[in-house]
Amino acid sequence: DAHKSEVAHRFKDLGEENFKALVLIAFAQYLQQCPFEDHVKLVNEVTEFAKTCVADESAENCDKSLHTLFGDKLCTVATLRETYGEMADCCAKQEPERNECFLQHKDDNPNLPRLVRPEVDVMCTAFHDNEETFLKKYLYEIARRHPYFYAPELLFFAKRYKAAFTECCQAADKAACLLPKLDELRDEGKASSAKQRLKCASLQKFGERAFKAWAVARLSQRFPKAEFAEVSKLVTDLTKVHTECCHGDLLECADDRADLAKYICENQDSISSKLKECCEKPLLEKSHCIAEVENDEMPADLPSLAADFVESKDVCKNYAEAKDVFLGMFLYEYARRHPDYSVVLLLRLAKTYETTLEKCCAAADPHECYAKVFDEFKPLVEEPQNLIKQNCELFEQLGEYKFQNALLVRYTKKVPQVSTPTLVEVSRNLGKVGSKCCKHPEAKRMPCAEDYLSVVLNQLCVLHEKTPVSDRVTKCCTESLVNRRPCFSALEVDETYVPKEFNAETFTFHADICTLSEKERQIKKQTALVELVKHKPKATKEQLKAVMDDFAAFVEKCCKADDKETCFAEEGKKLVAASQAALGL
């Protein structure tokens, strides 16, 4: 249903508050270096213009597309060339090429200062002095650091952020009330950003079909009582929502997400019995709740899949004449029966099935050829099961920090060309799979672990894409979305790697390490560990453990010393010498 004025349509649908917030997010995700005040000015100008269009949809420029309006506005920024360099060339293009150009310049790792949390009293004063600006600043700071953050979900985070300050700034112990809430929002926010980044990568790098396959599998697990037509409708709508958000069409995305939540709640009887509580909540909470809702119970009386997809002599006829429906139905039926499998495993099985049919349906005796296709699934299922079992045992034995260290060593040996900060960040996140998933019973471990690992490895892929340094990373990241984790798992030590030259500066530490939080201190130590492995990739576990134990003792000793700086200087030299000797550097 075409509207005379798209901007008026979205303004009316979303309301002024959400409209302004979403435009701010969109602008901050495109122009990540622009000061807050500049963005606020641009947003206010767009909002005033939208109001004129609401008043009269035939007014001048009101018929222009949102991309045209927003792009024109972004291109008025005076310092575009100085701040963004070649991104300024986007402004010479016409839509839709101009928007595509802006999208290509989104930076997953922008050169922005780390967000330092002010004192609680300072934050509460700022919140009370100007609540609106305070909350806008939150949206701006998150959006510019996470240019693919799911915009309607960021509105939900902002609502919780506001609620935290509203409650805690009047509490007796403000810090005790506020800080845990902010920590939780930060951690959840990072996880949400990474999950959405994978969705966008899936759409942008592997296409709509790949995303739809992922969505069919996930929604079939979540809504196993919903019939195929219902799941297909939800998949189509969800794909539209995520395509819009990943494409920078945040107003349309938020509007369509709200429509989808409304549809799901109106039709919950034919979708899932678990939606009742979600559907009683206000819009932002409702959408979030639906996205996180637990899997419904599997319906009774599901017959074996073998009859229709293996034993039937008409498989090739059905496949040839209705390829997408047949494969979609296979994935749906398999996924709804297997909430215990990861989505990526289900997609591997579907791909194996498709490949087998492609081969067998051209064979002399197709039925004889595909009769054993389900047997091919066995090793594909056992591989992640065994890997998770081994790694959970290792996690339980070592604890999170040492488990992360084991992964740091493992991944540095696999891809030593990758930058140290990236290896530390990715390995730390990989290591979190232990505390996140190993506590679950067997039936929930694989979907938790392997789908989480897909999200983390996508972080590695997007960071590496910005500055590619390893052919092995490029290969694992680009060949197959669903085989990324098995591809990285299969990598052995990179024998072609020339060890990094030893640089004493890398291993020089100062007294400032003593005032760091436990997390920051761990990161320092883990950075040193990566560098050690880069210098000595053939070092054994035992050698590395000895050096790291010495290092921990050194930090502990010097942090207790009266003259910390002198201790770090003198003992540090000794440690470096001892480490070199121990590792044969």
Epitope: A229, A307, E321
Partner: antibody, heavy 120, light 107 residues
Framework: EVQLVESGGGLVQPGGSLRLSCAAS????????MNWVRQAPGKCLEWIGH???????YYATWAKGRFTISRDNSKNTVYLQMNSLRAEDTAVYFC??????????????WGQGTLVTVSS | FELTQSPSSLSASVGDRVTITCQAS??????LAWYQQKPGQPPKLLIY???DLTSGVPSRFSGSGSGTDFTLTISCLQPEDFATYYC??????????FGCGTKLTVL
């Protein structure tokens, strides 16, 4: 409520044609293979054919040529077109839902049936 | 393929254990269903995939077999169980076949 309702049965002369309808409610026909089964008075169940989720129709050997199954997803209805009817086609005609989109069985959901009488 | 059901009729008393067999002319793996039909009603699914009991069906009904030979057993016959029972073979192709039924009557 999930149900199937057949209609269109009645008295027809030998050599005549009839189109039976099966209207589904409470679920979407397009998700399932939809079957037609008949039962002559006091006789066995006899499968006629089905149309699957890929819109591919399959028929019992004896039904090919005279019987055609189709569906209209927008009306959530499946049809059985019967031509050149004979006295031995007299039966109650049931519509039944397959377990999945490409299933030939089992049939958990059945309509109540519609009687077709072929007689001069 | 064809399905041969036996016996074609059977008389029994309440409390009896009753067995009906169904033989396929070729292997159909475990793709066999059993239905109960009462006069004027459509068939009702009791067992699918040879031995899986449909939800809501009493546990006195059980199915067994695979390949070509299948059995439906009613362990302790109840008054409401007197009806005609059909087997159905499916899955070997996109066609399906019914047996010709076993009429179970009161002795």
């Amino acid at each position: 409520e999930v149900q199937l309702v057949e209609s269109g049965g009645g008295l027809v002369q030998p050599g005549g044609s009839l189109r039976l309808s099966c209207a589904a409610s409470g679920f979407s026909l397009s998700s399932y293979a939809m079957n037609w089964v008949r039962q002559a008075p006091g006789k066995c169940l006899e499968w006629i054919g089905h149309i699957n989720a890929g819109d591919i129709a399959y028929y019992a050997t004896w039904a090919k040529g005279r019987f055609t199954i189709s569906r209209d997803n927008s009306k959530n209805t499946v049809y059985l077109q019967m031509n050149s009817l004979r006295a031995e086609d007299t039966a109650v005609y049931f519509c039944a839902r397959g377990a999945g989109g490409f299933s030939t069985g089992p049939f958990k959901l059945w309509g109540q049936g519609t009687l077709v009488t072929v007689s001069s | 393929f064809e399905l041969t059901q036996s016996p074609s009729s059977l008389s029994a008393s309440v409390g009896d254990r009753v067995t009906i067999t169904c033989q396929a002319s070729e292997s159909i793996n475990s793709r066999l269903a059993w239905y109960q039909q009462k006069p004027g009603q459509p068939p009702k699914l009791l067992i699918y995939d040879a031995s899986d009991l449909t939800s809501g069906v009493p546990s006195r009904f059980s199915g067994s077999g695979s390949g070509t030979d299948f059995t439906l057993t009613i362990s302790c016959l109840q008054p409401e169980d007197f009806a005609t029972y059909y087997c159905q073979g499916y899955g070997g192709s996109s066609t399906t076949t019914f047996g010709c039924g076993t009429k179970l009557t009161v002795l």
